[in-house]
């Protein structure tokens, strides 16, 4: 259950994370399962353990095998297994299936290809990207942070993409490569000026003082994956985070839904323990994309207690 496959190429760096997690303060011990031999923590070793990480700097084919990590929590010793396979470098250009990370799909509007496992390494930009062993050149390709963006994606852009970067450990540099397939969805999408489905313009929302209230800002932006689209709430023309009222929070992350094939986003504004002063604020639901911005304003009113009987 707590087992994970990891792979790499000989003479490259490989860093593996223990499949069991834990607090940073927890001790993690690593063992080579076949011999039950402890993995050293001293960085002078080619293979060494560093907390939840097992580092092969660089990896060798003989390192292949199952490694056991034991996370020592205050109650239990929690065990995980890392199944590591190190392969010889191929002389030809083809990347075999067993070296491939998960396939990603893209479309004309969304063509990000993330470099797999890069978050485990100490690397600095820029990344180098290759497609079918050829270095990517031209203005259509942009290496941005840990991903590649392809402008105006076409079906011919499908293929195997390899990212290459340098891992630095105590001043020593090690090369790392990772490859994944990219497929192009034939998506006849379009984008239009945002349409806010809720709330209605100048809506009055009834709330009860002392209770919690939720306002949902929901807007659609076109069909298919949208490259730039967002919905958010403002209070009296100020971003929620800048307004400084901890009782009033936007729900983390925007929910994406596809209504009748349309790409729509929701953002929920949660008001805890509604106060009288909340009724004086102006609540703006904003929807924006490349075409522009649309705003719907909501105000709160006190729910008449008599309503409960009607």
């Amino acid at each position: 259950k707590f087992s994970k496959q990891s792979w790499g190429l000989e003479n490259e760096a490989l860093i593996v994370r223990c499949p069991r997690q834990g607090k940073p303060s927890y001790t993690v011990d690593w063992y080579y399962s076949q011999t039950n031999k402890s993995i050293p923590t001293q960085e002078r070793n080619r293979v060494f353990a560093s907390g939840q990480l097992l580092k092969f700097l660089p990896a060798a084919v003989a390192d292949s095998g199952i490694y056991t990590c034991i996370v020592r929590s205050p109650t239990f010793n929690r065990t995980g297994y890392a199944n590591v396979t190190i392969y010889k470098k191929q002389s030809d250009c083809n990347v075999p299936d067993y070296l491939m990370y998960s396939t990603v799909s893209g479309s004309e509007k969304n063509s990000k290809i993330y470099c797999p496992t890069i978050d485990l390494y100490n690397w600095t930009a820029p990344l180098e990207w290759f497609k079918n062993c050829q270095a990517l050149q031209g203005s259509r390709y942009r290496a941005h942070k840990s991903f590649l963006v392809i402008d105006n994606v076409m079906t011919e852009d499908a293929g195997d993409y390899t990212c290459k970067f340098i891992h630095n450990e105590n001043g020593a540099n090690y090369s790392v490569t990772a490859t994944r397939s990219f497929t192009v969805k034939d998506e006849q999408g379009f984008s239009l000026f945002p349409v806010i489905g809720a709330p209605a313009q100048n809506e009055i929302k009834e709330v009860e003082i002392g209770k919690n209230a939720n306002l949902t800002c929901s807007a659609c932006f076109g069909k298919g994956t949208q490259f730039l689209a967002a919905v958010l709430w403002q209070l009296n023309g100020t971003k929620i985070t800048d307004f400084g009222e901890p009782r009033i929070q936007q729900e983390e992350g925007q929910n994406q839904s596809f209504s009748n094939g349309l790409a729509c986003l929701d953002m929920v504004l949660r008001i805890a323990d509604v106060k009288e002063e909340d009724l004086l604020l102006q609540y703006d639901c904003l929807a924006l994309n490349l075409h522009g911005l649309r705003r719907h304003t909501v105000r709160l009113s006190r729910k008449n207690p008599i309503d409960h009987h009607s």
């Epitope: 259950k1 069991r20 997690q21 834990g22 607090k23 303060s25 996370v71 929590s73 205050p74 109650t75 239990f76 929690r78």
Partner: antibody, heavy 121, light 106 residues
Framework: QVQLVQSGAEVKKPGASVKVSCKAS????????LHWVRQAPGQGLEWMGT????????VYNQKFKARVTMTADKSTSTAYMELSSLRSEDTAVYYC??????????????WGQGTLVTVSS | EIVLTQSPATLSLSPGERATLSCSVS?????MHWYQQKPGQAPRLLIY???KLASGIPARFSGSGSGTDFTLTISSLEPEDFAVYYC?????????FGGGTKVEIK
Amino acid sequence: QVQLVQSGAEVKKPGASVKVSCKASGYTFTDYELHWVRQAPGQGLEWMGTIDPETGDTVYNQKFKARVTMTADKSTSTAYMELSSLRSEDTAVYYCTRAFYNDYDEGFAYWGQGTLVTVSS
Amino acid sequence: EIVLTQSPATLSLSPGERATLSCSVSSSVSYMHWYQQKPGQAPRLLIYDTSKLASGIPARFSGSGSGTDFTLTISSLEPEDFAVYYCQQWNSSPLTFGGGTKVEIK
């Protein structure tokens, strides 16, 4: 949703044993350690120990080590806590409880409703 | 074992007031968890890892501290906040709880 449902109240005589059950639902039983906490009338909370249902491994509070046995039945997703050699000071509400996410030990997010065990001659 | 001492034992306040509850630890711990308990109910997790708000808990609750001194703050007491509050450490076995602070209506 996660639910921990405990067995009903028990009345026991001093020297006897009691076995409290805790039936889990709404999640994979073997993925989470289950803990037992007790609370004597008008008193605070006291951790008794924990079991890993996957392996059956247990860690007990030294105070109870000689008298407590925690077990788990994977087939019914039920954990049990048996306390022997009961005395009057064992009169308490016994809770089973679980963390929100196992590996990070972020406090007890889910609790059973509690089982009152009364020890009286 | 690690001993947690809560103070005050009882806190008498009015709705709308600020409540500050303390938890002192016999030896340094990395994190503290806080629970609320009402009569006849199981405890409810309020704050985990010293300062993180548990799911569904209002933002008026906050936690802080490090090492041997931790604090739970209720910025403005609501009627439903009058209850007993416990701190708990998960730094070493046995896991231990504080003796509790009762927040009562003045």
